[in-house]
């Protein structure tokens, strides 16, 4: 098992996932492609928690780049042991992975709350409110109730799709960071087993 290659693989995956999280979160600000609702503050409160931009996005880039950097061979040895520095790096990646766990966890929690509460929309009685808040998430299973939202157009589908994407992406990020915690601990304790000659695919 090459712990460095595995970490690099996780790092590259996290960069992609973080960018997707940022895109999904940004799209939540423009229901039906309109800017009017953001400027009028007619967006779900959970959109303003920046869970995809900060939690699943920017905060995820820190561990991602740490993991990518682990496979480089210019790590200094210590006490005459070349692998010592790499071991320290692997163990320090655990700390970066924990930051990633916190970020992705935040993303998952906010996305789940956003899904459960439903969107802020103009209901059929001309009121801007959280139309589905009292259904405790049951509206997700009963699409016939989605007609209660008359504005923004397709807001329920928009919110459900994007918060579901954030939930899934955050969940994957969480699992990958958890894997890196295990990988980092094993790599730090068992040693950096990769020689320059060993080649592993992601």
């Amino acid at each position: 098992m090459c712990y460095g290659k595995c970490a690099r693989c996780i790092g590259h995956s996290l960069v992609g996932l973080a960018l997707l999280c940022i895109i999904a979160n940004i799209l939540l600000y423009f229901p039906n492609g309109e800017t009017k609702y953001a400027s009028e503050n007619h967006l779900s409160r959970f959109v303003w928690f920046f869970s995809g931009i900060v939690g699943g996005g920017l905060l995820m880039l820190l561990p991602a780049f740490v993991f990518i950097g682990l496979e480089q061979d210019d790590c200094c040895g210590c006490c005459g042991h070349e692998n010592c520095g790499k071991r320290c790096a692997m163990l320090s990646s655990v700390l970066a992975a924990l930051i990633g766990i916190a970020g992705s966890g935040y993303c998952v929690i906010v996305a789940a709350l956003g899904l459960a509460e439903g969107p802020l929309c103009l209901d059929s009685f001309g009121q801007w409110n959280y139309t589905f808040a009292s259904t405790e998430g049951q509206y997700l299973l009963d699409t016939s109730t989605w007609s209660q939202c008359t504005e923004p157009k397709h807001i329920v589908e928009w919110n459900v799709s994007l918060f579901s994407i954030l939930l899934a992406l955050g969940g994957i990020e969480f699992i990958l960071c958890l894997i890196q915690v295990i990988n980092g601990v094993l790599g730090g304790i068992c040693g950096f087993c990769c020689s320059r000659q060993q080649q592993y695919d992601c």
């Epitope: 209901d123 009685f125 001309g126 009121q127 016939s144 109730t145 007609s147 008359t150 504005e151």
Partner: antibody, heavy 116, light 107 residues
Amino acid sequence: EVQLQQSGPELVKPGASVKLSCKASGYTVTSYVMHWVKQKPGQGLEWIGYINPYSDVTNCNEKFKGKATLTSDKTSSTAYMELSSLTSEDSAVYYCSSYGGGFAYWGQGTLVTVSA
Amino acid sequence: DIQMTQSPASLSASVGEPVTITCRASKNIYTYLAWYHQKQGKSPQFLVYNARTLAGGVPSRLSGSGSVTQFSLNINTLHREDLGTYFCQHHYDTPYTFGGGTNLEIK
């Protein structure tokens, strides 16, 4: 003061179509929803559907699909309901009602009589 | 479609006394219920939505309550202008069906 002015009474022949209008005036809210309701003489209320004139989102009672078509003109603040293939069962008073900001305003109603 | 059943179909009460009208839904509609008042030959008036939120301009002697399938409209002190027919309407999913109405007469 908000007012909903509905078009006058209509006497139409069976099989014909009729287009009812509902003009809103005195509005302070930009987002509102216009509903249409049917009431046969001496009977209860029946929900036909609604239209949001800003988003053009419409929703119609399945019972009135193919019977009622809801449209609106933002520039003139007027909502329309076209009723097609009229029969004696369609003889009723049709109300438009506008909801916005916790208030609701109703038109005076349009009496549609279907008779040969 | 969700069926809305109102009771009683008609009632007579004296000015100053409290009145309660009930409405039952055929399935769980949470708190998605509205109440209307219609006087003879007039357009309906919107009273309550979301089961308990009073619409603008509605006097505070009226109040709505209930959830799931059982709802009620209460008038704590009956006034002469309260006579007419009261309708409940669910707004949970389409079609937004109305109850059959409760005709309130003044004794």
